[in-house]
């Protein structure tokens, strides 16, 4: 049984950076409208993007079933290639790891191959990010 005196309490790292967002609708040639169902998330959504505060590797999970065939990309920085890029799909169930840094913003871009669809509906739309390097550099 371990006993700690006040002066012996180990340093407390901030909680692991993670977020689970949902999306039920995407806009053609724009992105998906993301909402965070929990107010307790350690990462935040701003301007339809997930804000990255901590450098490091992130586990990224993306799921959803779409009302139309579409091409979907997940970006993290203007002028850089996408984290994910899927062409002509009606569903996605992907998982991967990517290095992200402070000031990055994770956001969607969606295009359909029909001019008649402005809105795309999504069942089970979910994006999860989990930071894999707690204790690394963070800026808030």
């Amino acid at each position: 049984c371990l006993h700690f005196y006040a002066s012996q309490v180990p340093p407390q790292y901030p909680p692991i950076q993670s977020i689970r967002v949902q999306f039920t609708r995407c806009e053609n040639e724009k992105g998906c409208i993301i909402t965070s169902p929990s107010k307790d998330e350690t990462m935040k959504v701003q301007d339809n993007s997930i804000i990255i505060n901590c450098d490091g590797f992130y586990l990224i999970s993306l799921k959803g079933y779409f009302s139309e065939e579409l091409s979907l990309s997940l970006y993290y920085r203007k002028g850089r290639g996408p984290l994910f890029s899927l062409s002509k799909v009606t569903s996605v169930d992907s998982i991967g790891v990517a290095y992200l840094a402070f000031k990055d913003k994770v956001y969607f871009n969606v295009t359909t191959h029909s001019t008649s669809y402005k809105d795309i509906q999504v069942n089970g739309g979910e994006l999860i990010l989990i930071h894999q390097n707690p204790g690394g550099f963070c800026a808030y």
Epitope: Q22, E68, E69, T90
Partner: antibody, heavy 118, light 106 residues
Amino acid sequence: EVQLVESGGDLVKPGGSLRLSCVASGFTFSSNYMSWIRQAPGKGLQWVSQISGDGIYTNYADAMKGRFTISRDNAKNTLYLQMNSLRDEDTALYYCATGIYPNAFGYWGQGTLVTVSS
Amino acid sequence: SYVLTQLSSKNVTLKQPAHITCGGDNIGSKSVHWYQQKLGQAPVLIIYYDSSRPTGIPERFSGANSGNTATLTISGALAEDEADYYCQVWDSSANVFGGGTHLTVL
């Protein structure tokens, strides 16, 4: 196993109101768009309305706009259709439907009958 | 609003192919779903996204979509295939069903 059970259908006079319910089980209700689809006796299928999994987005067929309101209670796994200013032509079997993909209705209830007559 | 046109009825000889069509302006650019409805029963999804078949639907059912016509094909119609068949698309914030085709198997 996915199950959709509708209720609330009744005989109502023109101009009257009715609220239909659909209790869902066997899938993650809050993840799915849900729709109401109706079928008049001896006629074809007619889509009525849909609502997104989070309840934020709704759409209606033109003939139902302003008279019908779709809603959901994800805590109760229940879909609703509030029908006001009912007309004779609203007489139909009302189905609740959903699917793995939005708008591809792989799961249907057995329907609840609404009869509008004086 | 978008209109889908189906023949109201069609006859097919037992074990012969049946082609049920669904017409719509530039329907080939849209995703088409097909349903089978037998008398007194709820509809059943038999084809989604033009040509995909849900689990449990026999291989004799297939779909195609191009130009202004979507087609549901039953490669060899059986007596149990006698039913109403509906096509459906999503267009401009609304789902639209065709009027339905009643298939009679002779």
